[in-house]
Amino acid sequence: DAEFRHDSGYEVHHQKLVFFAEDVGSNKGAIIGLMVGGVVIAC
């Protein structure tokens, strides 16, 4: 696909960055847990 060709020396990109500063808050890792017998289990 010519639209996504890459020259020699460049690899296909896979990572997604937080490029816009305004997205910093919406991309902070959230810990969602389940309380089981007094212990929080991450899920």
Partner: antibody, heavy 112, light 112 residues
Framework: EVQLVESGGGLVQPGGSLRLSCAAS????????MSWVRQAPGKGLELVAQ????????YYPDTVKGRFTISRDNAKNTLYLQMNSLRAEDTAVYYC?????WGQGTLVTVSS | DVVMTQSPLSLPVTLGQPASISCRSS???????????LHWFLQKPGQSPRLLIY???NRFSGVPDRFSGSGSGTDFTLKISRVEAEDVGVYYC?????????FGQGTKVEIK
């Protein structure tokens, strides 16, 4: 792999309308701001619209304000640009961009 | 809007020699998280812009280590340690600290 694929460009008469679409894949679309950037022949990059991750905030430069509308459907992983009252000076390649990734571009030609 | 000013606008280079492009912003690009969202793109003829350096000095995946970025606050630099034939094109600096996303005018790099 992250991909952004635009569609909807073409030839339109002055005063006409077009709706561009950008199908996103390979990342969690709903977490990221998105933009439309255009490039007139032989010119530099010009932002024409920007929208935040949830679609609640948008930005337009004066050159397109009131004529262009950016929107997104996070359920469909798709970004849109509705372009009305098109002018000859809107002729350009329009790119959908997440900043780090750009689509292949779609050509919009406004001519009678 | 934040104005991005690049220099030079045209840069003839010799293969194997270093090259440097300067970018200045009209206001500080430091965000509240301590990062400067200053980026560098390369656009080759007929292609979409491609991210080279993000947040001042970080090479994007797959970008050769001959590319490096530096700077802080309002003054930034892109350096190519040894120019190769595939490095020709137009280089843009860009900021995404502030809305709207803005670009420099572009620096055209060509082989002497």
């Amino acid at each position: 792999e992250v991909q952004l694929v635009e569609s909807g460009g073409g030839l339109v008469q002055p005063g006409g309308s077009l709706r561009l679409s950008c199908a996103a894949s390979g990342f969690t679309f709903s977490r990221y701001s998105m933009s439309w950037v255009r490039q007139a022949p032989g010119k530099g990059l010009e932002l024409v619209a920007q929208i935040n991750s949830v679609g609640s905030s948008t930005y337009y430069p004066d050159t397109v304000k009131g004529r262009f509308t950016i929107s997104r459907d996070n359920a469909k992983n798709t970004l849109y640009l509705q372009m009305n009252s098109l002018r000859a000076e809107d002729t350009a390649v329009y790119y959908c961009a997440s900043g780090d990734y750009w689509g292949q571009g779609t050509l919009v030609t406004v001519s009678s | 809007d934040v104005v991005m000013t690049q220099s030079p606008l045209s840069l003839p280079v010799t293969l194997g020699q270093p090259a440097s492009i300067s970018c200045r912003s009209s206001q500080s690009l430091i965000y509240s998280d301590g990062n400067a969202y200053l980026h560098w793109f390369l656009q080759k003829p007929g292609q979409s812009p491609r991210l080279l350096i993000y947040k001042v000095s970080n090479r994007f995946s797959g970008v050769p280590d001959r590319f490096s970025g530096s700077g802080s606050g309002t003054d930034f630099t892109l350096k190519i340690s040894r120019v190769e034939a595939e490095d020709v094109g137009v280089y843009y600096c860009s900021q995404s600290t502030h809305v709207p996303w803005t670009f420099g005018q572009g620096t055209k790099v060509e082989i002497k």
